[in-house]
């Protein structure tokens, strides 16, 4: 015979636990239904009646199956140095991240307390380590044979173009100038940018190796955003 399905509320067998999406109510000493994300427990269960759930009010949320008496308050509106990357809904908190060109200098438990603008590398210097959502840009001097002529948080040092006849030799902040109408091969077709940090979650970018004689074509791209951490409403 198939096992009889118990409907909530029910008294669990001694030593057993309640099923998924149920919780044990200490007062009623019964297994009772949890409320779904976006809801909270309006009335707790008794021996004869199950949990009564109600929708979260505006600006409040529950992210998980729960039996909390009140929904959690969404965080305050994003400040001027941040952008809202996830809106406050009944099922999720608002997420604020630093705007493009900024990084989270001071973090808090959830989100960012204070954003700061990314440093930029000046001419003669290139990006050694790009900024991430939680770390600043690191610059390095352009090695002999390479240059950067920009003030940028993304540009790396690029190799000088190779000339048949050099009119003006390149230096750390300027490309070589050729006398012939065109160089034998242009090593620097355009500014090479490191990927900008995408303002969602922290990412791990690796430093791009310094090009020695030939430009690198395989840049290490940042990994995609990691999934958000689970909320704290209990499962």
């Amino acid at each position: 015979l198939p096992a009889q399905v118990a409907f909530t509320p029910y008294a669990p067998e001694p030593g057993s636990t309640c099923r998924l999406r149920e919780y044990y109510d200490q007062t009623a000493q019964m297994c009772c239904s949890k409320c779904s994300p976006g809801q909270h427990a309006k009335v707790f269960c008794t021996k004869t009646s199950d949990t009564v759930c109600d929708s979260c009010e505006d600006s409040t949320y529950t992210q998980l199956w729960n039996w909390v008496p009140e929904c959690l308050s969404c965080g305050s509106r994003c400040s001027s140095d941040q952008v809202e990357t996830q809106a406050c809904t009944r099922e999720q908190n608002r997420i604020c991240t630093c705007r493009p060109g900024w990084y989270c200098a001071l973090s808090k438990q959830e989100g960012c307390r204070l954003c700061a603008p990314l440093r930029k590398c000046r001419p003669g210097f290139g990006v050694a380590r790009p900024g991430t959502e939680t770390s600043d840009v690191v610059c390095k001097p352009c090695a002999p044979g390479t240059f950067s002529n920009t003030t940028s948080s993304t540009d790396i040092c690029r190799p000088h173009q190779i000339c048949n006849v050099v009119a003006i030799p390149g230096n750390a902040s300027m490309d070589a100038v050729c006398t012939s109408t065109s160089p034998t091969r242009s090593m620097a077709p355009g500014a090479v940018h490191l990927p900008q940090p995408v303002s969602t979650r922290s990412q791990h970018t690796q430093p791009t190796p310094e090009p020695s004689t030939a430009p690198s074509t395989s840049f290490l791209l940042p990994m995609g955003p990691s999934p958000p951490a689970e909320g704290s409403t209990g499962d």
Partner: antibody, heavy 125, light 109 residues
Framework: QEQLVESGGGLVTLGGSLKLSCKAS????????ISWVRQAPGKGLEWIAY????????DYATWVNGRFTISLDNAQNTVFLQMTSLTAADTATYFC??????????????????WGPGTLVTVSS | IKMTQTPASVSAAVGGTVTINCRAS??????LAWYQQKPGQPPKLLIY???DLASGVPSRVKGSGSGTEFTLTISGVRCDDAATYYC????????????FGGGTEVVVK
């Protein structure tokens, strides 16, 4: 030579308006953030607003309350501060300032390494 | 974030040492700068990131501290050090109550 020069200050009547200019030279203007900072006679420094030309972002101190607007003319390498509803409390020397260009190769917008000489604004009744 | 500087004024003898304190109302890690301002001039950056010396600043000027407590120390004080000194946190946005401290006047005797 990296330089910032303010202009447009002067005497203005209570409730009046004034537009200050900050002309930049010798810097990569489109990549540098510019802030306005003021100093009332005998008082301390007070940050007003900033603008980042390459990101087009602006922000203001809370006390500004919509009375001031920061803007820029990229072609002229100039940042402006439009001030309205001026009161006696706005009497100050107004400085424009930009980030710190370090010898180790970076430009850090968090700190003010380059300042203009300032322009005096006097609000009289 | 609110920045509070102490003392408001301090006097020092030539060759002596001056210590100026700056307190942040909340943790700002090491995102702090110090400036020197003389009458009729704009401020000059002395220290950034709490302890790094700006270009051209003599090594007798020292910045220290992190979190909420910061100190500027000038040793071997010279007449030229007579000025007002300001601290500044690196987060100038509309969320900041005061970006700069109130200033400390240094008088050299």
């Amino acid at each position: 030579q990296e330089q910032l020069v303010e202009s447009g200050g002067g005497l203005v009547t209570l409730g009046g308006s004034l537009k200050l200019s900050c002309k930049a030279s010798g810097i990569d203007f489109s990549s540098y953030g510019i802030s306005w900072v003021r100093q009332a006679p005998g008082k301390g420094l007070e940050w007003i607003a900033y603008i980042y030309p390459d990101y087009g972002s602006t922000d203001y101190a809370t006390w500004v309350n919509g009375r001031f607007t920061i803007s820029l003319d990229n072609a002229q390498n100039t940042v402006f501060l439009q001030m309205t509803s001026l009161t006696a409390a706005d009497t100050a020397t107004y400085f424009c300032a930009s980030g710190y260009a370090s010898s180790s190769g970076y430009y850090d917008p968090k700190y003010f390494g380059l300042w203009g000489p300032g322009t005096l604004v006097t609000v009289s009744s | 974030i609110k920045m509070t500087q102490t003392p408001a004024s301090v006097s020092a003898a030539v060759g002596g040492t001056v210590t100026i304190n700056c307190r942040a109302s909340e943790d700002i890690e090491s995102y702090l700068a110090w400036y020197q301002q003389k009458p009729g001039q704009p401020p000059k950056l002395l220290i950034y990131d709490a302890s790094d010396l700006a270009s051209g600043v003599p090594s007798r000027v020292k910045g220290s501290g992190s979190g909420t407590e910061f100190t500027l120390t000038i040793s071997g004080v010279r007449c030229d050090d007579a000025a007002t000194y300001y601290c500044q946190h690196g987060f100038y946005t509309s969320r900041s109550d005061s970006v700069f401290g109130g200033g400390t006047e240094v008088v050299v005797k």
